[in-house]
């Protein structure tokens, strides 16, 4: 049995996968910040997790996916205000009783030290210093991400 949050997450990911291929992104758009091979957009407004997920989707992006602790630290370094929380693309899957990224993968327990409960209707936020489990209905800021396309050096045949 999937929760409404899970259904929304799956629906948005599927609709994103169905959209036509777009040319690779070589530079971050205006107002997006580059972090390694990603462009990040930190919202100024606040929304529940579902609305944040939908907003990133309309921007042809996704809620932030964090690969490892190193990426978490680098992302947190971009957060200017101590007290502000941002949604990322991780929520609790009731059916699998585990934290699940919006791309379908499960959280490696070593990646993030989450403060708070792992239970139904819990979604993950990050601050400058910590990672928190919050009710998904809580209205906070959020981070969208776009992947940058790596530029490959062209190899020219001998002339």
């Amino acid at each position: 049995q999937k929760s409404s949050i899970e259904k929304c997450s799956v629906d948005i990911q599927q609709s994103r996968n169905k959209t036509t291929e777009r040319p690779g992104l070589l530079n971050c758009p205006i107002y997006w910040q580059q972090l390694r091979e990603k462009c990040l957009l930190f919202s100024h407004t606040v929304n529940p997790w579902n609305n944040s997920l939908a907003d990133c989707s309309t921007k042809e992006s996704s809620l932030l996916l964090i690969r490892d602790k190193d990426e978490l630290i680098h992302t947190q370094n971009l957060i200017r205000d101590k007290a502000i929380l941002f949604w990322i693309g991780l929520n609790f899957s009731l059916s699998e009783k585990n934290w699940k990224w919006i791309n379908g993968s499960f959280l490696n327990s070593n990646d993030l030290e989450i403060r708070g409960d792992a239970k139904e209707n819990s979604c993950i936020s990050i601050s400058q210093t910590s990672v928190y489990s919050e009710y998904c209905s809580t209205e906070i800021r959020w981070i969208c991400q776009k992947e940058l396309t790596p530029v490959r050096n062209k190899v020219y045949p001998d002339s």
Partner: antibody
Framework: QVQLQESGPGLVKPSETLSLTCTVS????????WSWIRQPAGKGLEWIGR???????NYNPSLKSRVTMSEDTSNNQFSLKLSSVTAADTAVYYC???????????WGQGTLVTVSS | QSALTQPPSASGSPGQSVTISCTGT?????????VSWYQQHPGKAPKLMIY???KRPSGVPDRFSGSKSGNTASLTVSGLQAEDEADYYC??????????FGGGTKLTVL
């Protein structure tokens, strides 16, 4: 180049509903948020509200009970409705791009709406 | 009555520097780094000059700079030029997705 153009009646009767549309060119309205701002003659600016194309709207608390905003992504337009207008709603109404939800980087040229019988 | 307080007028001679203040509360200016400034010439739409306290959009001369201390934000125009004569408005995010403006300051180049 991003351009915004407001359109709608320049004269509205008291107690009726003011309706304006903003047409955006040079950018997809799906990519940003969009706001309405007004300015009575010789006075300061007042933010009315914003719309996200994901369906969310945020309104100025002082106007919330009278404001409705909607969008038409197929025509790259968004709209404002302000109900139960009075002479105090007479102003130049601007639509603007609201990239992150706290500032406005592209504005329409504005349209004057007069509330009078 | 505007939510943010600006002086009604400011002036300076060409080449001089002028600073316009914008005072709010801890719920708006003091609470967020989301202050912006707009220039408006008579009969024209406002133009964004500064956002996120001190960032300048492309095309805005570096003579315009922004700063913030506590509940007060400031716009400084250095090397004043005749075309800088206009009304200037500050704005701030004010929590729960609200935005507030100042009452405006008329800048006169003497």
């Amino acid at each position: 180049q991003v351009q915004l153009q407001e359109s709608g009646p320049g004269l509205v009767k008291p107690s009726e509903t003011l309706s304006l549309t903003c047409t955006v060119s040079g950018d997809s309205i799906r990519t940003y948020y969009w706001s309405w701002i007004r300015q009575p003659a010789g006075k300061g600016l007042e933010w009315i509200g914003r719309i996200y194309t994901s369906g969310t709207t945020n309104y100025n608390p002082s106007l919330k009970s009278r404001v409705t905003m909607s969008e038409d992504t197929s025509n790259n337009q968004f709209s404002l409705k302000l109900s139960s207008v009075t002479a105090a709603d007479t102003a130049v109404y601007y639509c603007a791009r609201d990239p992150l939800g706290s500032f406005f980087d592209y504005w329409g040229q504005g349209t004057l709406v007069t509330v009078s019988s | 009555q505007s939510a943010l307080t600006q002086p009604p007028s400011a002036s300076g001679s060409p080449g001089q520097s002028v600073t316009i203040s914008c005072t709010g509360t801890s719920s708006d200016v003091g609470g967020y780094n989301y202050v912006s400034w707009y220039q408006q010439h008579p009969g024209k739409a406002p133009k964004l000059m500064i956002y996120e306290v001190s960032k300048r959009p492309s095309g805005v001369p570096d003579r315009f700079s922004g700063s913030k201390s506590g509940n007060t934000a400031s716009l400084t125009v250095s090397g004043l030029q005749a075309e800088d004569e206009a009304d200037y408005y500050c704005s701030s995010y004010a929590g729960i997705n609200n935005v507030v403006f100042g009452g405006g300051t008329k800048l006169t180049v003497l």
